[in-house]
């Protein structure tokens, strides 16, 4: 029987290799192989300061796989020098390119600075480097630009240790002075560049219509057309203040809807430091300013000021316990100032203004009191002006400012009122200043 032998066929298949990949400039390829066939892959890594880009679009990683038709599944990316782009603008400041004009690539250096005199840099020294991650970064590691904070407590006034019984203010003497119209005439003091500190009673009637408050800064004459206009974004009245029931917690903050430009006529007042009490002892001199009633019984045309000494708290409490002022309304949240002989005082229309003191260590003025209340007859002998004691409210002020933001939104929408109310009934016989 014949033997049968069949065909023996051996199939061998050689996968078509992919084109040999060339790493882009400033990049390297891994793994390096003699050839790359089906399902082989490679990755591209860029040198420090260079980033993977596919066109304009960034990639964190790149890997290509060899396909069965002998082509790579994606094109080679580039390794481009990291470009941090133009640095953010600095409000009230500027940026200088140190490495070279408009150079924004890896290791480039820029220097932020604030407008001299009226602003100071907060957070860091203003030097930023373009790092490999593509962010402008300070020596402390911050990616956000610094902040130019207004310098507070600057005054043109030559400090006199030597408004009712007062003198005329000159330009730049009280650059924190704010005139508040809309209800009755009142005052306030600028904090930072978009907050006004005032008395709760001064704006209470407008609390639900904050946008009606006509807020004027940089004015010297009450009726002058030369001033900077501001509007309220929100009003914050102390939750412990009860209108027409005593004057405890007579403090409020107004957030402006835009930051104001600081200059020699518009500068914020400083808040008191912890050590400030040492400049507000009995007989220390504070200065109150305003457009309130003068000795002639009329609202002042020109901004007036008066230098008045702090009065011993017990003496002040006693003065207001005598008829017709009985009621013991002077609390630990208040301080008193004035002359026992009378003649120098704040008065109606000065409400909400600042009683300021010079910090002898920093040579800056700070707000120690807010004009609140006093006897019916301003400057009366044996009676004193009563002021909200600001140092007691530093946590309240800082809490509101941090929670409700430093920057005015400048956006639309109606101004709002924020407060928590605890009503208590109590009679009083004193007038609001």
């Amino acid at each position: 029987m014949a033997s049968m032998t069949g065909w023996k066929i051996h199939y061998t298949s050689t996968a078509q290799p992919c084109p040999y990949p060339m790493a882009p400039p400033n990049g390297h390829l891994s793994p390096v192989q003699a050839k790359y066939i089906l399902k082989d892959s490679f990755s591209i890594f860029c040198e420090p300061g260079y980033e993977l880009l596919q066109g304009h679009l960034p990639l964190k990683s790149f890997a290509a796989v060899c396909q069965k038709d002998g082509s790579w599944d994606q094109p080679m990316p580039s390794c481009s020098i990291v470009d941090c782009g133009p640095p953010d603008d600095l409000p009230s400041g500027r940026v200088e390119y140190i490495t070279g004009p408009e150079v924004t690539t890896y290791k480039a250096v820029i220097q932020y600075s604030c407008e001299e005199t009226f602003y100071t840099m907060k957070v860091n020294d203003g030097k930023y480097v373009c790092e490999a991650d593509g962010f402008w970064t300070s020596s402390k590691g911050e990616r956000s630009p610094p902040v130019c904070e207004p310098v507070c407590g600057l005054s043109a006034r030559t400090t006199g240790g030597r408004i009712y019984g007062g003198q005329k203010a000159k330009p730049g003497d009280f650059p924190w002075q704010v005139l508040i119209l809309g209800g009755s005439t009142a005052a306030g003091a600028l904090l930072y560049d978009n907050w006004v500190l005032t008395a709760a009673h001064a704006i209470y009637e407008q609390k639900h219509d904050a946008s009606s408050l006509d807020i004027r800064l940089g004015a010297l004459k009450r009726l002058s057309p030369h001033y900077t206009q501001a509007w309220a974004e929100a009003v914050f009245i102390h939750e412990g203040y009860t209108h027409d029931a005593g004057f405890d917690n007579d403090i409020a903050l107004i957030k402006l809807n835009n930051k104001v430009v600081i200059n020699s006529n518009i500068t914020p007042i400083c808040l008191p430091r912890k050590e400030a009490e040492s400049f507000m002892r009995t007989d220390d001199i504070g200065t109150a300013s305003g457009w309130g009633l003068t000795q002639r019984g009329l609202l002042a045309r020109n901004l007036m000021y008066v230098d008045i000494p702090i009065v011993d708290h017990q003496k002040c409490t006693a003065a207001y316990e005598k008829p017709p002022y009985s009621g013991g309304s002077v609390t630990a949240n208040m301080l008193c100032a004035g002359l026992e002989s009378g003649g120098k005082d704040s008065c109606r229309g000065d409400s909400g203004g600042a009683l300021v003191f010079l910090d002898n260590e920093t040579q800056r003025w700070f707000v120690g009191g807010i004009v609140s209340w006093g006897s019916m007859n301003c400057g009366e002998a044996g009676q004193y002006g009563v002021y909200t004691k600001v140092i007691n409210y530093i946590p309240w002020i800082k809490n509101i400012i941090s929670n409700f933001g430093g920057g005015g939104s400048g956006g639309g929408g109606s101004a709002k009122f924020v407060a928590a109310w605890t009503l208590k009934a109590a009679a009083h016989h004193h007038h609001h200043h």
Partner: antibody, heavy 114, light 107 residues
């Protein structure tokens, strides 16, 4: 499967700020790529608004740069668009998209009208 | 900004036809061009990236070519589901830009 979903108000008043959020599922926005916003006015072509990259860097169309902010919330795997001072010309379908467009959201129509 | 000029702006074709759409960039964009298909009321659907790379799941009748300033999208045999508007897109240079679109209609 990578999915993107836009959300936000469909009607915005002139001069106000348009705010939209893109929620990404199936991929972490910090893992890689650029996460874009693109818009298309009714009956018109596509316009790139800007992106936020995996590292948090942003790039904006210069024609809109002064009004645009793109940010992200990595804990929610979302990125957001804010466009301020809107006018009727900002009425469009707004899309979010990954990279140069391999994945897109379905789009959301935003009308600017009083 | 780089202008991406698409032509034609619209065309009429029949099922089975070979359709070619071109896109001209106002300056060199390398091969950083993508093509999208969009149907009314829908988001754009990606077809091609890096001028000639097809996204997975995209039928092989769609192909892209070109580099530098001249790019082409070809549909080798038009299917009923291909009637739509097609956009080119350059992602080479900031700001990213799109072509004005080509509407492919049934003849």
């Amino acid at each position: 499967q990578v999915q993107l979903q836009e959300s936000g108000p469909g009607l915005v008043k002139p001069s106000q700020t348009l705010s939209l959020t893109c929620t990404v599922s199936g991929y972490s926005i910090t893992s890689d790529y650029a996460w874009n916003w693109i818009r298309q006015p009714p009956g018109k072509g596509l316009e790139w608004i800007g992106y936020i990259s995996y590292s948090g860097r942003t790039s904006y169309n210069p024609s809109l740069k002064s009004r645009v902010t793109i940010s992200r919330d990595t804990s929610k795997n979302q990125f957001s668009l804010k466009l301020s001072s809107v006018t009727a010309a900002d009425t469009a379908v707004y899309y979010c998209a990954r990279y140069w467009g391999d994945y897109w959201g379905q789009g959301t129509l935003v009308t600017v009208s009083s | 900004d780089i202008q991406m000029t698409q032509s034609p702006s619209s065309l009429s074709a029949s099922v089975g036809d070979r359709v070619t759409i071109t896109c001209k960039a106002s300056q060199n964009v390398g091969s950083n061009v993508a093509w999208f298909q969009q149907k009314p009321g829908k988001a754009p659907k990606p077809l091609i990236y890096s001028a000639s790379y097809r996204y997975s799941g995209v039928p092989s009748r769609f192909s892209g070519s070109g580099s530098g300033t001249d790019f082409t999208l070809t549909i080798s045999s038009l299917q009923p589901e291909d009637f739509a508007t097609y956009f080119c897109h350059q992602y080479n240079t900031y700001p990213l830009t799109f072509g004005g679109g080509t509407k492919v209609e049934i003849k």
